[in-house]
Every structure is written in structure tokens, then in C-alpha cells.
């Protein structure tokens, strides 16, 4: 808090310009009019104010707009945005994508701060859903943004927005998130032909059910091992050896290197050793010949 002192003679600011960087904090407080600052906010970012000086300017805006800044001011905050607290940001009503972009630009290349998280939350809630343009913008600045949302929040993503998602945007998503995103992706890409469809859906397959994997196995997709290893274990277990062979195509040889890891390990335990031997990969751990496999889960479902 800067104490109130009279502005020294000849120092009253007529405009926001670079001469102000040489003002002491108390001089800024005394000599810069808050209304002038608000109308010339677009100049602030071009001037190398120290963060201490920006604190003074923020204080002046807070006094002028105790209920929250108007969007005309917010759009031009620039580095002053870094001095805002989440509490400040919760008072704002940000509706323009241009405003959002301008503020995200300030923090570009750095991890998402609490300020940015609050800003995005306010913006998305104001829009009612995560539309394609917003998602495009957010994932451009924060590739991991989508995976930071809860499954409940992801449910508000319309299928049309899925077109904006790049494979790297899903790198940190867990199975619960992919469970929500996969059906949306399936809907979004439903009109594409086989090979194009697979290219688009591949990143989302960690949420795919068994029946969809079986269908894919009939389409010569040649799924790579990295994608296979991210599939849901419960979706992989019911697949036959023949289906996995068709699904992976030439990549089936990679199963040997992954035989101790999930879901491959658990899948091997469910297959007949005879069937596994047909792959010629030396996979071990299948059900020995002559053993009867009882599917107890099926028994329970029938009773």
C-alpha cells in the first residue's frame, strides 16, 4: 500500500508513457489518474514498468472498478495480468475470445498458473460449453489442457470440438477421461472412411470398448504397439488371438517385448497356449491344453 502524498509540481501524468518508468511508487500513486490509466491501458504493456510499479497501477484500477474490470480494460492488461489474483479474476466477465488470447499470450511458454486456470474457468462457464474455437485456442497455449479437466467437465465438450484435438493434447489423459472423450470422437469422425477414421480415432482408443476393437480388427488398421498398450485392459481381454493379430497386423511381433506388461500380460493369461503358439512369437503363460475355462462373470450375469 502506497501512502497518499501530493504529486510534485510538474509531474502530473498527461498520458501513459515511458517517462513514468522513472517515477517512484508514491509518485505513480500521486500523479497518475486512474481514469486516464483505464483509457490508455493499451499503452501499459509497451512500457517496461517494474512489477512493483504494476502493483501501484493495479491498485488504481481496483479503486476505479471495485466490482471488477470492464472487458475493455481486461483485454489490454498485458503483464499486469500476472499481478491479478484468482479472486480478482472471479469478478470479471470475459466473453471475447480475443481477450482470452491476449491474456494467455502473456503467460505463453509457462505452466498454467492459478490466474490462468481461473480465467479459463470463467470464460468457459460464461460460454456454457467448450466450443471448437475455444478448445483450439486453449490447446494451442496449453497442450495438456484437455487432460486437466474432470470427466464431468469433459462431458460438456460437444463432439464438433473434437476436431480441434491433436494427439499430443491427450498425452496426459487417464482412462476415465478417455472414456468420456472416445464416444464423442467416434461420433465426430463417423463419416470418415476406414483408414482416415483410424488415423483420427487412434489417440482416443484408450476409451474404446471391446466391440469397437473387434470391428477395427476387421479393417486392416495395423495398430502400433504404443496405441495397443494404452487400450483398456477390460476391453482387450475378450479379444481372441486371431483378432489381436488382425488388429496389430505387422506390429504383432511387438507383443513379445511387452509380454510382462499390461494389458498384454493379462490378455496372454486369458488365451489358450495353443492359440498363442500360432503367432510364433514364443509367448508363454497361456491356458494349457486340455484345461476348461469357466467364465464366472458370464455365469453370474445369467443367474
Amino acid at each position: 500500500e502506497v501512502e497518499k502524498t501530493a504529486c510534485p509540481s510538474g509531474k502530473k501524468a498527461r498520458e501513459i508513457d515511458e517517462s513514468l518508468i522513472f517515477y517512484k511508487k508514491w509518485e505513480l500513486e500521486a500523479c497518475v489518474d486512474a481514469a486516464l490509466l483505464a483509457t490508455q491501458m493499451d499503452r501499459v504493456n509497451a512500457i517496461p514498468f517494474t512489477y512493483e510499479q504494476l502493483d501501484v497501477l493495479k491498485h488504481k484500477l481496483d479503486e476505479l472498478y471495485p466490482q471488477g474490470y470492464p472487458e475493455s480494460v481486461i483485454q489490454h492488461l498485458g503483464y499486469l495480468f500476472l499481478k491479478m489474483s484468482p479472486e480478482d479474476i472471479r469478478k470479471w466477465n470475459v466473453t471475447s475470445l480475443e481477450t482470452l488470447k491476449a491474456l494467455l499470450e502473456v503467460n505463453k511458454g509457462h505452466e498454467m498458473s492459478p490466474q490462468v486456470a481461473t480465467l479459463i474457468d470463467r470464460f468457459v462457464k460464461g460460454r456454457g460449453q467448450l466450443d471448437k474455437d475455444t478448445l483450439d485456442t486453449l490447446t494451442a497455449f496449453y497442450p495438456g489442457y484437455l487432460c486437466s479437466l474432470s470427466p464431468e467437465e469433459l462431458s460438456s465438450v460437444p463432439p464438433s470440438s473434437i476436431w480441434a484435438v491433436r494427439p499430443q493434447d491427450l498425452d496426459t489423459c487417464d482412462p476415465r477421461q478417455l472414456d468420456v472423450l472416445y464416444p464423442k470422437a467416434r461420433l465426430a469422425f463417423q463419416n470418415m472412411n476406414g483408414s482416415e477414421y483410424f488415423v483420427k480415432i487412434q489417440s482416443f482408443l484408450g476409451g474404446a470398448p471391446t466391440e469397437d476393437l473387434k470391428a477395427l480388427s476387421q479393417q486392416n488398421v495395423s495398430m502400433d504397439l504404443a496405441t495397443f498398450m494404452k487400450l483398456r485392459t477390460d476391453a482387450v481381454l475378450p479379444l481372441t488371438v486371431a483378432e489381436v493379430q488382425k488388429l496389430l497386423g505387422p506390429h504383432v511381433e511387438g507383443l513379445k517385448a511387452e509380454e510382462r506388461h499390461r494389458p498384454v500380460r493379462d490378455w496372454i493369461l486369458r488365451q489358450r497356449q495353443d492359440d498363442l503358439d500360432t503367432l510364433g512369437l514364443g509367448l508363454q503363460g497361456g491356458i494349457p491344453n486340455g484345461y476348461l475355462v469357466l467364465d464366472l462373470s458370464m455365469q453370474e450375469a445369467l443367474s
Epitope: I47, P48, T50, Y51, E52, Y79, L82, K83, V106, N107, G109, H110, E111, S113
Partner: nanobody
Framework: QVQLVESGGGVVQPGGSLRLSCAAS????????MRWYRQAPGKERELVAV??????YYADAVKGRFTISRDNSKNTLYLQMNSLRAEDTAVYYC???????????WGQGTLVTVSS
């Protein structure tokens, strides 16, 4: 974190020249602006010069005599001081602030004495 280390201070006669250097290390990619401040004995610390992008700014007392520059390839800030006067005697501090953390970093200072 950004670390700043100044060098180049010393004793010089009035009218002489000195070049101060400030070597930056650490998260230098996030530096937003760099500045030289000075503090004369018994006085407040004052801003001398700023470099911000490709723009430079100078306090009236040093305009035309001092030049601030930055070599990004060496992560070094410079202050070329010409036509030095007795009133330029002070400890000169290098300062940088960063994007993201919105923090200020300071060097330990280097003493410049202008005396005949």
C-alpha cells in the same frame, strides 16, 4: 530462478569510461526486461537505464553518456558509461524480471568510483 552477477566496476577519473557487465544464468528465456539501477552513498536506489525487447530507456541524468545493451547469445547485459562525473559514483545493480513468475531478480552490485 535467474542469477545475476555484475562485473566491471572500479575507480576512474572524471571524463573517463567504464563498461559494466551483468551475466545472467538460470531461466533466462523468461526474462522480460533488464535494468541498471544505482545507489549513491546515503541516497535512494535510482533507475538508470532499461532494455525491453529492442527498446532502451535512460534517466535524464545519464542520457547521451550511458548506453545499455544486451547480448542474448551470451546472456549478458552491458552498461557502457562515458564522460563519467563525480556524481555517477555509486554501487550499480543489475536487475531482471521474469514472465510467468512475475518476479524481480537482483545482482550483488558493483562499485563505481569517479574521482581524481
Amino acid at each position: 530462478q535467474v542469477q545475476l552477477v555484475e562485473s566491471g566496476g572500479g575507480v576512474v577519473q572524471p571524463g573517463g569510461s567504464l563498461r559494466l557487465s551483468c551475466a545472467a544464468s538460470g531461466s533466462t528465456f523468461s526474462i522480460r526486461a533488464m535494468r541498471w539501477y544505482r545507489q549513491a552513498p546515503g541516497k535512494e536506489r535510482e533507475l538508470v537505464a532499461v532494455i525491453y525487447g529492442s527498446s532502451t530507456y535512460y534517466a535524464d541524468a545519464v542520457k547521451g553518456r550511458f548506453t545499455i545493451s544486451r547480448d542474448n547469445s551470451k546472456n549478458t547485459l552491458y552498461l557502457q558509461m562515458n564522460s563519467l562525473r563525480a556524481e555517477d559514483t555509486a554501487v550499480y545493480y543489475c536487475n531482471a524480471d521474469t514472465i510467468g513468475t512475475a518476479r524481480d531478480y537482483w545482482g550483488q552490485g558493483t562499485l563505481v568510483t569517479v574521482s581524481s
